[in-house]
């Protein structure tokens, strides 16, 4: 539990002390306190580096002090022969005796009190971004006019986050532009636009000045774009660095400017405007668009046709054609579906006749049709050759989609008769 | 047949045998048979068969029987009540519905019906086959298919010849320009048991086919001339016949 | 006179080879089946194989299938037969036959053919 | 395939006798059916085709008979030149089959 003071004696003190001892006392005030040890009495067997007896005085894995021999004050108005003040509200303090004294040695008496530590001073890191504030226990920062302290109650910064912006078109600047921006401030700008139009950024070179990079190329300040899971940025330095047109493909923008303490420029300035959300023109084969476009956007609806000989091969049976709209996230609906080479199917067998089996039975493909010769002739005509036509009919120059038939050949016997010869 | 030779089917594959009674016939096409009048108007679901040379039982076991759907005698053709004392064969064609489709191949093929033309109007001396099953010079039947070639002839070379075993006067026979007279030539002639069978002539247009230009019909006498149904004059009946009952398939 | 021939028998040993033939004359020849009958020394007729007229048909006994080859040549007049893979049950006395309507009707002389090692 | 059965297979007659040769068929033959006559080292010669026609040239003493499988083989008046094998023959399907003979002597 921590104590505003006490009292720390070597054992037996003030008789002497025994050998072969090692005591530790822990000493912790109340937070915001330091502490303030002093020695008011100090005989302790003397030895180089004070090797033999000690008492050590420890701040977290810092040595403070390590003590031994005899002491006395300087003052004669103050029993103080030797004393520590330390910034922090915990301190060890551990005495040690080794297994001989050749004298007789009462070893020591020590003091100690929680002290004020002046926070906004006493350390070489300044806890205040702008103003320190010290009091008994403690310190708080603040902030200048039209600043804010952040939530780490350390850091001020602008309030400079929170807008939502929705319009189609709009501009947007760094805090006090063209005035230097505020140090240490993180700003978030949202923009928001309807589903199926995507935020496109523009900036002038000329209209960019934010601190430079360090020599690690890391920005100090930076401008960062971040539209889904793509991120344009971080962007630094005097006149933009990044694409003058920046197309995120997103109807969702956050726009982040960060700044450190120091070098502030004048900052930026941008516009930006909702587009369409463009929907590629994909290369779909075997098909043509209705309307044909340059670029197709949001809403944008095109009816897809197969070429002779292609049909859809998802959803209506035989289907020749399907629409297909340009969606608010930039893909066309449908896509899934595709224009596929018209199927024929295996063809139709006929009586005393055979057709081979074809290699494919796709559109543009051909087969023959033969009658079993010499015995049947094909008598419709047509030579019995049928392409899969785009109808997914196997069709045939003269007959169409008629099928051949095979006819007996009539009179023809397959032997001669021979008369006899008389 | 008399005076004929030995045949095979290969060299006849239109040749149907009739066994009740035992004729001759010609297939035409996938389900139609031609053949003479007389023979199915005793037996209008008469057994059919093809592709066999002989005509021994067993043979025909292994050959391919057809089955009658309907028989269609021509119209013209007039029934008696006592067919023996016939003396009038005009009109003697009929065509038979098969049940079911014929398969073509070496032994079974059919025969060409004439064409319409003059070019199908047959010459004194035109040569014709005939072949069957029938009374040969040693037989009253014979089991292995036979045939003859014989020339066509003046109809009077038919009415000359004393009809050999007459059921009335000889001035009671018909012959009409239905008719063809054929033989004479070396006694080679059709004969009792081959009736129905074509005679086959040489196509004018494509000399690789025969066509049926008659049908074994009658005779004065066997081994002398014959008399066949002339079916050139009766193309219209048989296309007509063959349109009215097929079945959608065919047409 | 119808006249036939038979030639070309004699002694082989078993699984050799002979072709008999038969001459035909004093008639047409091109218009009859033909048959090769064999008789066994001592023993019945055997009928063996039958050709068509033109040799397009032929049917061949269960006991010679796959071994004897018949086969004819019109323009000569002429019967063969093929015998390969000869057996000693094939020795016989080889006929060659003229076939009217299934009766053999005239018949050669005979050839008579020895199987033996 | 079908069996011939000849019987009986010899037989000793007198000139002049009636001589009957009989065959069976292991199955329905109809009249398919031929009779030969083979002399001591000689070709075999057609008598009788269809079981009861006289081949042309061959005299009328010999006849056949029968249909399905029974036949019958005659000679009314046995001559001394009638001394033979005689074998019958049927044609119903391939394989063409023959009786196993009859051997006719003089007594």
């Known amino acids: 539990e921590p104590t505003m003071y006490g009292e720390i004696l070597s054992p037996n003190y003030p008789q002497a002390y025994p050998s072969e001892v090692e005591k530790s006392w822990d000493i912790e005030v109340p937070e915001g306190y330091g502490i303030h040890l002093y020695f008011t009495h100090l005989d302790i067997e003397l030895s180089e580096n004070c090797a033999y007896d000690s008492v050590q005085i420890i701040s977290g894995d810092t040595e403070e002090g390590r003590l031994c021999g005899q002491r006395s004050s300087n003052n004669p108005h103050s029993p103080i022969v030797e004393e520590f003040q330390v910034p922090y509200n915990k301190l060890q303090v551990i005495f040690k005796s080794d297994f001989s004294n050749e004298e007789r040695f009462t070893g020591f008496a020590a003091y100690y009190v929680a002290t004020d530590i002046n926070e906004c001073t006493d350390f070489v890191d300044v806890p205040c971004s702008h103003f320190c504030n010290n009091f008994i226990g403690g310190y708080f920062c603040s902030c200048p006019p039209e600043y804010f302290l952040h939530d780490d109650m350390k850091n001020c910064g602008v309030n400079c986050s929170g807008d939502v912006f929705t319009a189609l078109i709009g501009e947007i600047a760094s805090p006090n532009y063209p005035k230097p921006y505020p140090e240490n401030s993180r700003c978030e700008y949202q923009i928001r636009l309807e589903k199926g139009f995507q935020v496109v950024v523009t900036l002038r070179r000329e209209d960019f000045d934010v601190e430079a990079a360090d020599s690690a190329g890391n920005c100090l300040d930076s401008l960062v774009f971040v539209a889904g899971d793509r991120q344009f940025g971080p962007y630094c330095g005097h006149g933009f660095p990044g694409p003058l047109n920046i197309e995120t493909k997103s109807n969702a923008l956050d726009i982040i400017f960060q700044t450190d303490l120091t070098g502030q420029k004048k900052g930026w300035k941008l516009r930006y405007h909702g587009d369409p959300m463009p929907c590629p023109k994909e290369d779909t084969p075997n098909s043509v668009w209705e309307p044909a476009k340059a670029k197709y956007v949001f809403r944008d609806v095109v009816q897809i046709t197969c070429l002779d000989g292609f049909e859809v091969v998802e959803g209506r049976v035989g289907a020749t054609s399907f629409y297909s709209t340009c969606q608010s996230n930039g893909k066309w609906s449908n896509s899934k579906l595709k224009c596929q080479p018209v199927d024929c199917g295996i063809p139709e067998s006929i009586e005393n006749g055979k057709v081979e089996d074809p290699e494919s039975t796709l559109f543009g493909s051909v087969i023959r049709y033969t009658c079993e010769e010499p015995y049947y002739y094909m008598e419709n005509g047509g030579g019995g050759e049928y392409h899969c036509a785009g109808n997914g009919s196997w069709v045939n120059e003269v007959l169409g989609p008629e099928l051949p038939k095979c006819v007996p050949v009539c009179g023809v016997p397959r032997e001669p008769f021979e008369e006899k010869q008389r | 047949i008399i005076g004929g030779s030995d045949a095979d089917i290969k060299n006849f594959p239109w040749q149907v045998f009739f066994d009740n009674p035992w004729a001759g016939g010609a297939l035409i096409n996938e389900y139609w048979v031609l053949t003479a009048a007389h023979v199915v108007e005793g037996n209008r679901e008469p057994t059919m068969y093809v592709g066999s040379t002989s005509v021994q039982t067993s043979r025909l076991a292994k050959s391919k029987m057809l089955t009658p759907e309907h028989v269609f005698i021509h119209p013209g053709w007039k029934l008696l009540e006592v067919p023996e004392g016939r003396t009038n064969f005009d009109n003697d064609i009929a065509l038979v519905r098969l049940k079911d489709p014929v398969k073509m191949g070496p032994t079974v093929s059919p025969i060409c019906l004439p064409g319409t033309s003059s070019d199908y109007n047959l010459m004194d001396g035109d040569l014709g086959l005939i072949s069957g099953w029938g009374r040969t010079e040693k037989r009253d039947r014979a089991v292995r298919l036979k045939a003859a070639r014989l020339p066509v002839a003046p109809l009077r070379k038919c009415k000359e010849v004393k009809v050999e075993k007459p059921t009335a006067d000889a001035e009671a026979y018909v012959f009409t320009p239905n008719m063809i007279c054929a033989g004479g030539e070396k006694g080679m002639d059709s004969c009792k048991g081959d009736s129905g069978g074509a005679f086959a002539v040489q196509d004018p247009n494509d000399k690789t086919k025969f066509y049926a230009a008659g049908l074994v019909s009658w005779g004065p006498q066997c081994g002398t001339y014959g008399l066949y149904t002339r079916v050139k004059n009766y193309v219209d009946w048989i296309m007509k016949t063959m349109q009215e009952n097929s079945t959608p398939r065919e047409d | 006179e119808v006249q036939l021939v038979e030639s070309g028998g004699g002694l082989v040993k078993p699984g050799g080879s002979l072709r008999l033939s038969c001459a035909a004359s004093?008639?047409?020849?091109?218009?009859?089946?033909m048959s090769w009958i064999r008789q066994a020394p001592g023993k019945g007729l055997e009928w063996v194989s039958y050709?068509?007229?033109?040799?397009?048909?032929?049917y061949y006994a269960d006991s010679v299938k796959g071994r004897f080859t018949i086969s004819r040549d019109n323009a000569k007049n002429s019967l063969y037969l093929q015998m390969n893979s000869l057996r000693a049950e094939d020795t016989a006395v080889y006929y060659c036959?003229?076939?009217?309507?299934?009766?053999?009707?005239?018949w050669g002389q005979g050839t008579l053919v020895t199987v033996s090692s | 395939d079908i069996q011939m059965t000849q019987s009986p297979s010899s037989l000793s007659a007198s000139v002049g006798d009636r001589v009957t040769i009989t065959c069976q068929a292991s199955?329905?033959?109809?009249?398919?059916l031929n009779w030969y006559q083979q002399k001591p080292g000689k070709a075999p010669k057609l008598l009788i085709y269809?079981?009861?026609n006289l081949e042309t040239g061959v005299p009328s003493r010999f006849s056949g008979s029968g249909s399905g499988t029974d036949f019958t083989f005659t000679i009314s008046s046995l001559q001394p030149e009638d001394i033979a094998t005689y074998y019958c023959q049927h044609y119903e399907d391939y394989p063409l089959t023959f009786g196993g003979g009859t051997k006719v002597e003089i007594k």
């Open positions: 036959a003229r076939d009217e309507n299934y009766a053999l009707d005239w």
């Open positions: 004093g008639f047409t020849f091109s218009d009859y089946y």
């Open positions: 269809d079981a009861s």
């Open positions: 050709i068509s007229r033109s040799g397009s048909t032929k």
């Open positions: 199955q329905d033959i109809s009249n398919y």
